[in-house]
């Protein structure tokens, strides 16, 4: 008794797929595989398959049902913090070759990394024109202010909304200040936060307000405090710089905007007699902490002149170092003071039309605004590598 095995039905490739090998007929133990076109993947029911091969059985049937070649779907793209996504190919279209466009919230954010255009590729990932699978980054625009010029020298002016949107009020022990960098860092003076270096959560950080005692402000909390390793507390003010990492990003708007860090070319805007602006809630001429945010426009002082002013007692020799810059009037009367510590001395970069931090309020004479004495500020440009390292590492 002998029997001939039945040939199997000719395999019809699914749409967007092909059969291999192609034979005139398929008999017992013959097999075929299905390969999908680029951008399509094998599916059996709802389940994806890595590969598909069917074998012809003795009864003339295939051992597996024909799969489908289903178009790859990258799925809804991830939300972009401080940005949005647009569907360019069609509303909600997320399949192979679909295009989406990420963009950042206008005015206050700018896109880093790439142009924001992503395509759904055959591997199922949204991919930028540079081949990146990760999201672009919306970085806050820095140095925007309602003030457009440094102007002439005057002091004790009340700040208006949007004038110093990087201004941060730091409470915790004493009143101090800082300046917002990016959307989750605060630049300040080491001496202002030294006591809290091991208890970062004790710092009460407020921004987006003009009035020191106002209940209307944006609250931020500290995750970590980074004091410059070269700073020695109670032994001068060299390296008087610190960074506070916030535990959450703040939302950038016209009242909360980071200050720019100085570019390499920044020193050309910080020469002797160039005007910088210091702001804060520190002591005023009346001897009390200011209720309203105040600012003063003051000129940079020749470094040798400043060094000489602080060579005489009670100041120890070498008080003014190359890591400091001085600002103020020889006649006195315009100065930062206690309570302003950690705040930014800012300058207008006339090329970029953005404000940048040139100095950090650090120290000065016992009597603020004293004639022949000047406010001393940490020279931020000397610390750009340190700042960038901390921010990139943490």
């Amino acid at each position: 008794y002998t029997s001939t095995a039945q040939p199997c039905p000719y395999p019809m490739a699914p749409p967007n797929g092909h059969v291999s090998p192609v034979q005139a007929k398929y008999i017992l133990k013959d097999s075929f595989s299905i390969f999908c076109e680029t951008g399509y993947e094998l599916l059996q029911g709802h389940l994806p398959l890595k590969s598909f091969t069917a074998v012809c059985q003795k009864d003339g049937s295939w051992d597996r049902p024909m799969p489908a070649c289903s178009i790859v779907d990258c799925g809804p793209p991830d939300d972009l913090p401080s940005g949005r996504v647009e569907y360019i190919t069609g509303p909600g279209v997320t399949t192979y070759k679909a295009v989406i466009q990420y963009s950042c919230e206008e005015t206050f954010y700018t896109m880093k990394v790439n142009d924001g255009k992503y395509v759904c590729e055959a591997d199922g990932f949204w991919t930028s024109s540079k081949g990146e699978k990760s999201l672009p980054v919306c970085e806050p625009v820095c140095g925007l202010s309602a003030r457009t010029t440094g102007g002439r020298i005057y002091g004790g002016q009340k700040a208006k909304p949007g004038d110093f949107p990087w201004q941060v009020l730091i409470l915790g022990g004493t009143t101090a200040a800082g300046a917002l960098l990016y959307d989750n860092w605060v630049l300040t003076a080491a001496h202002a936060v030294y006591e809290q270096k091991h208890d970062a959560s004790a710092l009460d950080i407020r921004m987006g307000t003009l009035k020191r005692l106002s209940p209307h402000y944006t609250q931020a909390w500290s995750e970590a405090v980074f004091i410059h390793e070269g700073y020695t507390h109670d032994a001068g003010f060299d390296n008087d710089i610190a960074l506070i990492k916030l535990n959450n990003k703040v939302v950038i708007n016209s009242n909360i905007t980071p200050i720019c860090l100085p570019r390499k070319e920044a020193e050309s805007f910080m020469r002797t007699d160039d005007i910088g602006t210091a702001s804060g809630w520190g002591l005023t001429q009346r001897g009390f902490l200011a209720r309203n945010l105040m600012y003063v426009d003051i000129p940079i002082v020749d470094h040798q002149k400043c060094t000489a002013a602080y060579e005489k007692p009670p100041y120890p020799r070498g008080s003014v170092t190359a890591n400091m810059l001085c600002a103020g009037l020889e006649s006195g009367g315009k100065d930062s003071c206690r309570g302003d510590s950690g705040g930014a001395l800012v300058f207008l970069d006339s090329e970029t039309e953005r404000w940048f931090v040139g100095g950090i309020v650090s120290w000065g004479s016992m009597n603020c605004g004293e004639a022949g004495q000047y406010g001393v500020y940490t020279k931020v440009i000397n610390y750009i590598p340190w700042i960038e390292n901390i921010i990139s590492d943490f």
Epitope: G75, G90, P91, E105
Partner: antibody
């Protein structure tokens, strides 16, 4: 809560124009694509047009292409539909509806009647 | 364009009964990961309301008696036990490509 409020409907003669508005609140308007959908009296739903979140991509049903223009003003949280060369068959309740992938929120609609 | 055909046009049932509404697409509206069919309920004088998205996901705030299933070209909306407020018109809609289209609707009425 999310709210979409349409306005601008009314009676217009064939060949006339009308501009519909949809005021949005309760969500970040600039982050979402928005659609116009219409429903003729006693009939089913018909998708009319879509505009992406930033306004750079727009799509239309063939029945309105070249006559209707969808636009948005993200600073005002408002969607618009400029309807020109109106026909009797454009008579319907016009709804604006939120989202890029399906219609998760709808306005209550504004009625457009095209009649001589 | 993709044509969606709903059946039946009218469904007469009593409260407590199970309702099964069908929606058939003229071509596949399923990808490797998603099924691009959504279901809406509309009552007289009201705007439609989203019930089910991507064929089987229940929209928040919608009772669990509503469920969706299907893939490829055939989809189903099921209401496990009808409540008086469920009697309305039900539409399926695809978002596979533009133009997005709706089915002609199924009217669910009290028997």
């Amino acid at each position: 809560q999310v709210q979409l409020v349409e306005s601008g409907g009314g009676v217009v003669q064939p060949g006339g124009s009308l501009r519909l508005s949809c005021a949005a609140s309760g969500f970040t308007f600039s982050n979402f694509g928005i659609h116009w959908v219409r429903q003729a009296p006693g009939k089913g739903l018909e998708w009319v047009a879509y505009i992406s979140s930033g306004g750079s991509a727009v799509f239309y049903a063939d029945t309105v292409k070249g006559r209707f223009t969808i636009s948005r003003d993200n600073s005002k949280n408002t969607l618009y539909l400029q309807m020109n060369s109106l026909r009797a068959e454009d008579t319907a309740v016009y709804y604006c509806a939120k989202s890029d992938r399906y219609f998760d929120y709808w306005g209550q609609g504004t009625t457009v009647t095209v009649s001589s | 364009e993709i044509v969606l055909t709903q059946s039946p046009a009218t469904l007469s049932l009593s409260p407590g009964e199970r309702a099964t509404l069908s929606c058939r697409a003229s071509q596949s509206v399923s990808s490797s990961s998603y099924r691009y069919i959504h279901w809406y309920q509309q009552k007289p004088g009201q705007a439609p309301r989203l019930l089910i998205y991507y064929a089987s996901n229940l929209e928040s705030g919608i009772p669990a008696r509503f469920s969706g299933s299907g893939s490829g070209t055939d989809f189903t909306l099921t209401i496990s036990s009808l409540e008086p407020e469920d009697f309305a018109v039900y539409y399926c809609q695809h978002s596979w490509e533009t133009p997005w289209t709706f089915g002609q609707g199924t009217k669910l009425e009290i028997k």
